[in-house]
């Protein structure tokens, strides 16, 4: 049961951040313009990573699309790449989870495949937050150094006084956006990974042979050979049938009260 | 066609206020800011502030601010502005102005405020 | 606030001819975002609500004819009428609005000589 929560709330999780990043990439406030020296501007300019846009004194927005490619700082592009790819590979993770997914039969779909699966989509959805993550945190890097770089060219010239005055980019609420997505991503990737281990197979246990010595009655049961998962050993609780054994965290090949939800 | 139609005018006592609406038509209410501007006799068009027909939200020149108030009715596409503490200087044309490139005029309130 | 000085306050030419008149900002209006300058040119005729010529300092509102034309960037601008018709005899107002308060020119009245 503890098992489907934490795939189930891992799921939820990394859709949530998926669509926060899609969102983020999708969003045209990236930057927007730093009102700290023109508090009172009548024209607010804010960028995307695909267009920028002006809004107007008469209240109209008008945006403009990046057409060129390679006119492009290689930094802009470089964030672009790495929101694509962490949006690809969330969702091709929102994919193969829902396949892994506990509460949902496919077919006669081994544990071990559901495992390997939840495990392949927490990895998906750990790289997917993370490449989210790096990109939004590129671009405020990008942001910030430009900043102080404008900064300091609105304080020289002719004593100071600029009579065009550079406009200046901080933090748009994209940014915040991504980096929220993203640490949930990642937060659904992990708990995916914690997921598969309870749903991996972790001891394949033969029929308890008995060998009696004569004048002694000690058994020799050959149980020591165990499956290896890669994810350690769970030894709490094992219950030894005729029929070989099983962990209580496995799902049972006929239906239970939580196989449908 | 986009039209802003302005009430008639008015003859206020200094210390009085006013109220002067604006109409639109022709276009979405909601689409763009409504504008004021004032115009006193032999002068300079002076900007007294807008509203975001949107959400309310205002802003004011600091010449009115505290005895200009900005306000609408959606529902009507109607766009009011007051103004209180009347002084014989307030005697001016009152335009609302909208659209993209503030492009489209009322064509203007007389407000006279003589005692 | 943006002052916004226009010269000269009046103006007598006869029909036919060319005509300039200047504005000019106290800050600029060069907006880096989208390349614009936020300056808008009006004509007023007496008893009558400003009427849109030209935006963004050079473009002209559609309806107001090729004979007006607008240039400039930053702080100063030029409001040029290549042939006066009898029609454009009127007071022209340059406006900022790039930052508020949106304040205006003083006006340039263009009267028949």
């Known amino acids: 049961m503890a098992v489907t929560a934490c795939q189930g709330l891992g799921f939820v999780v990394s859709l949530i951040g998926i669509a926060g990043i899609i969102a983020a990439t999708c969003m045209d406030q990236w930057s927007t313009q730093d009102l700290y020296n023109n508090p009172v501007t009548a024209v607010f300019n804010y960028q995307g990573l695909w267009r920028s846009c002006v809004r107007e004194s008469s209240g109209f927005t008008e945006c403009r699309g990046y057409f060129t490619l390679l006119g492009l700082p290689a930094m802009l592009q470089a964030v672009r790449a790495l929101m694509i790819v962490g949006i690809v590979l969330g969702a091709i993770g929102l994919l193969v989870s829902i396949f892994a997914l506990k509460c949902i039969r496919i077919g006669s779909m081994e544990d071990s495949a559901k495992a390997n699966m939840t495990l392949t989509s927490g990895i998906m959805f750990i790289v997917s937050g993370l490449c989210a993550i790096a990109g939004v945190s590129v671009f405020a890097n990008m942001l910030v150094t430009n900043f102080w770089m404008s900064t300091a060219n609105m304080y020289t010239g002719m004593g100071g006084m600029v009579q065009t005055v550079q406009t200046r980019y901080t933090f748009g609420a994209a940014l915040f956006v991504g980096w929220v997505a993203g640490g949930l991503t990642l937060i659904g990737g992990v708990m995916m990974c914690i997921a598969c281990r309870g749903l991996a197979p972790e001891e394949t246990n033969y029929k308890a042979v008995s060998y009696h010595a004569s004048g002694h009655s000690v058994a020799y049961k050959p149980g020591g050979f165990k499956a290896s998962t890669g994810f350690g050993s769970n030894t709490k609780n094992k219950k030894i049938y005729d029929g070989g054994a099983r962990t209580e965290d496995e799902v049972q090949s006929y239906p239970s009260k939580h196989d449908y939800v | 066609q986009v039209q802003l139609v302005q009430s008639g005018a008015e003859v206020k006592k200094p210390g009085a206020s006013v109220k002067v609406s604006c109409k639109a038509s022709?276009?979405?209410?909601?689409?763009?800011?409504m504008h004021w501007v004032r115009q006193a006799p032999g002068q300079r068009l002076e900007w007294m502030g807008y509203i975001n027909p949107n959400n309310g939200g205002t802003s004011y020149s600091q010449k009115f601010q505290g005895r200009v108030t900005i306000t609408r009715d959606t529902s009507a596409s109607t766009a009011y502005m007051e103004l209180s503490s009347l002084r014989s200087e307030d005697t001016a044309v009152y335009y609302c102005v909208t659209t993209r490139y503030l492009a489209v005029w009322g064509q203007g309130t007389t407000v006279t405020v003589s005692s | 606030d943006i002052q916004m000085t226009q010269s000269p306050s009046s103006l007598s030419a006869s029909v036919g001819d060319r005509v300039t008149m200047t504005c000019k900002s106290s800050?600029?209006?060069?907006?880096?975002?989208?390349?614009?300058?936020?300056l808008t040119w009006y004509q007023q005729k007496p008893g009558k609500a400003p009427k849109l010529l030209i935006y963004?300092?050079?473009t002209r509102e559609s309806g107001v004819p090729s004979r007006f034309s607008g240039s400039g960037s930053g702080t100063d601008f030029t409001l040029t009428i290549s042939s006066l018709q009898p029609e454009d005899f009127a007071t022209y107002y340059c406006?900022?609005?790039?930052?508020?308060?949106?304040?205006f020119g003083g006006g340039t009245k263009l009267e028949i000589k």
């Open positions: 406006q900022n609005d790039y930052s508020y308060p949106l304040t």
């Open positions: 800050q600029s209006l060069f907006n880096s975002g989208n390349q614009k300058n936020y």
């Open positions: 022709g276009y979405t209410f909601t689409d763009y800011n």
């Open positions: 963004w300092a050079s």
